[in-house]
């Protein structure tokens, strides 16, 4: 016997050939011998089955002696052994309809797990293995879980079902709901304007929620919220914002924060969090802002940082086309009775310069220049 | 529910191959046939040809020395490709879902034969 | 082939009169025709299926009758959005064919 794999929802084409390559009389049947489909002439005939309005035949090929089965929007109580009557020829089919569904919303946060769900008709025995969009296999019966969603598991994951060395295949659409970045850095001098983006690593038509910016600066002995907002259909409307400092937002996507002077006292981490209609939980990341400044008193010029910097970060203070005079994994550097010039302050990771300020050291008898 | 794209060369000239793809959106590609059929300016609808998912063709006796349909099921694709065409294969070509009736059509590709 | 000849070739009406479009088949095709509504810049839409059929979506004031060789569509009351070029089609045999279609204008 034939058999015949079909997914849920699907159309299926089950063929029966007749050994005349002419137009003559058939009928398919179910196991229970129900009619189901036939011809009288060039009529096409539908029997009392449950099928009935999600049959069909293709008239055209009748004259080449095929006698086509076509169920519509199969359903996985369709599993069944269909039985085609041409002439003196009997051929059976069997029918065997697969479904496979994601546990709730194919739209899911970072972190949270998926749960795949195989229906199958009663008597099967199909295994099912399925890829995810970053090439991770994963096997399983009728049930495939992935617990800890990462970014890179959005997209589509191509999941087949093995049943009597016969395969079909299905294509689900996984959305990750995360920012593009977990974390970000800005490296900005002081009285410079800070602007903080959150791209979305995906994209849905409306989108609604609310977030929050709450930041911690290293000065501080606890964090403070410093902005909160809502989200309507991609539209951004601030709801609460702090009087120091006084963030903008930007009305639009992506999620984007402009600092208007970046000061000693912001330098710190913040986290900013999305809550998104009809999820749990919410979406995050984090920011860092780290702060520069270069000064001269008297005769002590001094270069400082503030904020989250790695202690591999090097903080020199140069001569501009000499060598550096000081140079320390340290937040703060000095020269004593610097030589006239200008200066160059630099924070830098493995030689490449991450932040740089510059300041005009003038002849003892003049006050100093900051360009 | 079912959507169909289709793209391909606006303009060609005698004696080249026509060549147009189908992309089917939502819904079944396995158990139904894609046909193709082209209307030449301002006269009828004229069927092509047409193919299954298992690559099972028919196609119209009159076209049928010039004409190749093929299916790439990984990408729930059709193509059309026609050869040798002269001015008379000037038309707005149209992709289609068949059973026995054509439901529903692509947005049709207008194809300029000239030299 | 299958010859399929439709009448008129033209047609003018009004906004809420009846129109009566015939097609006939070179030779008998039971009930394998469909109806087809066709407006120029888009693609054509079916009407009518199994000569008699109405097409999910497509308003009660299109019919179809007919079987053998002779086939009508009817359409009971024109509104605005009908105004177009209808063909009918066999799907009995291969190759499928066409009618050379009747354009319904506006009187």
């Known amino acids: 016997k034939k058999v015949v794999l079909g997914k849920k929802g699907d159309t299926v084409e089950l063929t029966c050939t007749a050994s005349q390559k002419k137009s003559i009389q058939f009928h398919w049947k179910n196991s229970n011998q129900t009619k189901i489909l036939g011809n009288q002439g060039s009529f096409l005939t539908k029997g009392p089955s449950k099928l009935n309005d999600r049959v069909d035949s293709r008239r055209s090929l009748w004259d080449q002696g095929n006698f086509t089965l076509i169920i519509k929007n199969l359903k996985i109580e369709d599993s069944d052994t269909y039985i085609c009557e041409v002439g003196d020829q009997k051929e059976e089919v069997q029918l065997l309809v697969f479904g496979l569904t994601a546990n709730s919303d194919t739209h899911l946060l970072q972190g949270q797990s998926l749960t795949l769900t195989l229906e199958s008709p009663p008597g099967s025995s199909p295994s099912v293995q399925c890829r995810s969009p970053r090439g991770k296999n994963i096997q399983g019966g009728k049930t495939l879980s992935v617990s800890q969603l990462e970014l890179q598991d959005s997209g589509t994951w191509t999941c087949t079902v093995l049943q009597n060395q016969k395969k079909v295949e299905f294509k689900i659409d996984i959305v990750v709901l995360a920012f593009q970045k977990a974390s970000s850095i800005v490296y900005k001098k002081e009285g410079e304007q800070v602007e903080f983006s959150f791209p979305l690593a995906f994209t849905v038509e409306k989108l609604t929620g609310s977030g929050e910016l709450w930041w911690q600066a290293e000065r501080a002995s606890s964090s403070k919220s410093w902005i909160t907002f809502d989200l309507k259909n991609k539209e951004v409307s601030v709801k609460r914002v702090t009087q120091d400092p006084k963030l903008q937002m930007g009305k639009k996507l992506p999620l984007h924060l402009t600092l208007p002077q970046a000061l000693p006292q912001y330098a710190g981490s913040g986290n900013l969090t999305l809550a998104l209609e009809a999820k749990t939980g919410k979406l995050h990341q984090e920011v860092n802002l780290v702060v520069m400044r270069a000064t001269q008193l008297q005769k002590n010029l001094t270069c400082e940082v503030w904020g989250p910097t790695s202690p591999k970060l090097m903080l020199s203070l140069k001569l501009e086309n000499k060598e550096a005079k000081v140079s320390k994994r340290e937040k703060a550097v000095w020269v004593l009775n610097p030589e006239a010039g200008m200066w160059q302050c630099l924070l830098s990771d493995s030689g490449q310069v991450l932040l740089e300020s510059n300041i005009k050291v003038l002849p003892t008898w003049s006050t100093p220049v900051q360009p | 529910q079912v959507q169909l794209q289709q793209w391909g060369a606006g303009l060609l000239k005698p004696s080249e191959t026509l060549s147009l793809t189908c992309a089917v959106y939502g819904g079944s590609f396995s158990g139904y046939y894609w046909s193709w059929i082209r209307q030449p300016p301002g006269k009828g609808l004229e069927w092509i040809g047409e193919?299954?998912?298992?690559?099972?063709?028919n196609y119209n006796p009159s076209l049928k020395s010039r004409v190749t349909i093929s299916v790439d099921t990984s990408k729930n694709q059709f193509s059309l490709k026609l050869s040798s065409v002269t001015a008379a294969d000037t038309a707005v070509y149209y992709c289609?879902?068949?059973?026995?009736?054509?439901?529903?059509w692509g947005q049709g590709t207008l194809v300029t034969v000239s030299s | 082939d299958i010859q399929m000849t439709q009448s008129p070739s033209s047609v003018s009406a009004s906004v809420g009169d009846r129109v009566t479009i015939t097609c006939r088949a070179s030779?008998?095709?039971?009930?394998?025709l469909a109806w087809y509504q066709h407006k120029p810049g888009k693609a054509p839409k079916l009407l009518i299926y199994?000569?008699?059929s109405l097409q999910s979506g497509v308003p009660s004031r299109f019919s179809g009758s007919g079987s053998g060789t002779d086939f009508t569509l009817t359409i009971s009351s024109l509104q605005p959005e009908d105004f177009a070029t209808y063909y009918c089609?066999?799907?009995?045999?291969?190759?499928?064919?066409f009618g050379q279609g009747t354009k319904l204008e506006i009187k």
């Open positions: 199994a000569a008699s």
């Open positions: 193919i299954n998912h298992s690559g099972s063709t």
């Open positions: 030779q008998d095709i039971s009930s394998w």
């Open positions: 289609a879902r068949v059973i026995n009736w054509f439901d529903p």
């Open positions: 089609q066999q799907a009995n045999s291969f190759p499928y064919t």
